[in-house]
């Protein structure tokens, strides 16, 4: 939901977490605000305390259950409200009927590891975290490699258009330090976005053998 200088944006991690950001220019920093979640077909309600992340924005995580529990489906609608304290009462500031599987952002991939490294090549694997079994294989990945003297923003993106939890990096320079990151996105959902980037994995290619290219 957006209006002028106010914005209320939430994403579902596909399992048991809805993360929300509420921003409003000119809002008082010390105002106490919460997000209330009210599903249309579940018996639970959930609340989280919005905490400041910048001058005019607040964030919180609605924890719906244990990390790998499947708390919502594609037919669920969760009414989300931003409630802020005004004196003795709570005032509703923003509202949306949230369709979880239209607003997906998965957790960053985890457990990155070097499977095999050579002078010019490196095979890396990873795992997805807290991703719904509903996706089956309908996921895609983006990866990037940080080369010496460059920034992450300059790194070209490699796209994996299928659920492939490994990559073979080629044309690398021998005896060189690199870093690698990957992110994931389900194919489902009108407002679905990429996960955060994984923690970078540092690796070094093997030195070239003496007397060889």
């Amino acid at each position: 939901a957006v209006n002028g200088t106010s914005r209320f944006t939430c994403f579902y991690n596909s399992r048991a977490n809805i993360s929300c950001v509420w921003s409003q220019d000119g809002a008082l920093q010390d105002t106490s605000c919460q997000v209330h979640a009210w599903p249309d077909r579940r018996r639970w309600n959930q609340t989280c305390e919005l905490l400041p992340v910048s001058q005019a924005s607040w964030a919180c995580n609605l924890i719906l259950g244990t990390p790998d529990s499947q708390k919502l489906t594609a037919v669920d609608i969760v009414t989300l409200r931003v409630m802020c304290r005004e004196g003795v009462r709570w005032r509703m500031m923003a509202i949306q009927d949230f369709k979880p599987f239209e607003n997906l952002r998965l957790m960053a991939p985890i457990s990155l590891q070097v499977v095999h490294v050579e002078t010019h090549r490196c095979n890396i694997s990873w795992k997805i975290s807290q991703a719904s079994h509903y996706f089956e294989r309908h996921l895609e990945f983006e990866a990037r490699t940080l080369s010496p003297g460059h920034t992450w923003e300059e790194a070209p993106l490699m796209t994996l258009k299928q659920k492939q939890e490994w990559i073979c990096l080629e044309t690398l320079t021998p005896d060189t330090q690199y870093e690698f990151q990957v992110r994931v996105k389900p194919l489902q959902g009108e407002f679905t976005t990429w996960s955060p980037w994984s923690q970078p994995l540092a690796f070094r290619t093997k030195p070239a053998a003496l007397g060889k290219d």
Epitope: A1, N3, M92, M93, I95, Q96, D97
Partner: nanobody, 126 residues
Framework: EVQLVESGGGLVQAGGSLRLSCAAS????????MAWFRQVPGMERELVAA????????VYRDSVKGRFTISRDNSKNTVYLQMNTLKPEDTAIYVC???????????????????WGQGTQVTVSS
């Protein structure tokens, strides 16, 4: 602050029609969704219909769907409730409400609204 004044209520026979109006004044730039609620003495106030700021979205309680129509004329700062095929069970005080909150839901509740009118009586006789 926003002031809401309702009009158009009255006594009507079952099967008849009425058109309620709710005129807003004051800090109307802050208003987003508007709604009509109704209340029968001794009962909780219930949502009848709501409409978004631009009029593009609306929601109705099941018992009035197909009979009542909510509309909005922002140039006149007025919201209307056209009530057709009225039934005795529609008898109530009809109250206009407005919220400053951004966004939209199909599940409005009383506490979502910041401003309230005084209400207008609708009586449907059989």
């Amino acid at each position: 602050e926003v002031q809401l004044v309702e009009s158009g209520g009255g006594l009507v026979q079952a099967g008849g029609s009425l058109r309620l109006s709710c005129a807003a004044s004051g800090s109307i730039f802050s208003i987003n969704a508007m709604a009509w609620f109704r209340q029968v003495p001794g009962m909780e106030r219930e949502l009848v219909a709501a409409i978004s700021r631009d009029g593009g979205a609306s929601v109705y309680r099941d018992s009035v769907k197909g009979r009542f129509t909510i509309s909005r004329d922002n140039s006149k700062n007025t919201v209307y409730l056209q009530m057709n095929t009225l039934k005795p069970e529609d008898t109530a005080i009809y109250v206009c409400a407005a919220t400053r909150a951004i966004g939209w839901t199909a599940r409005w509740i009383t506490t979502d609204f910041d401003f309230w009118g005084q209400g207008t009586q609708v009586t449907v006789s059989s």
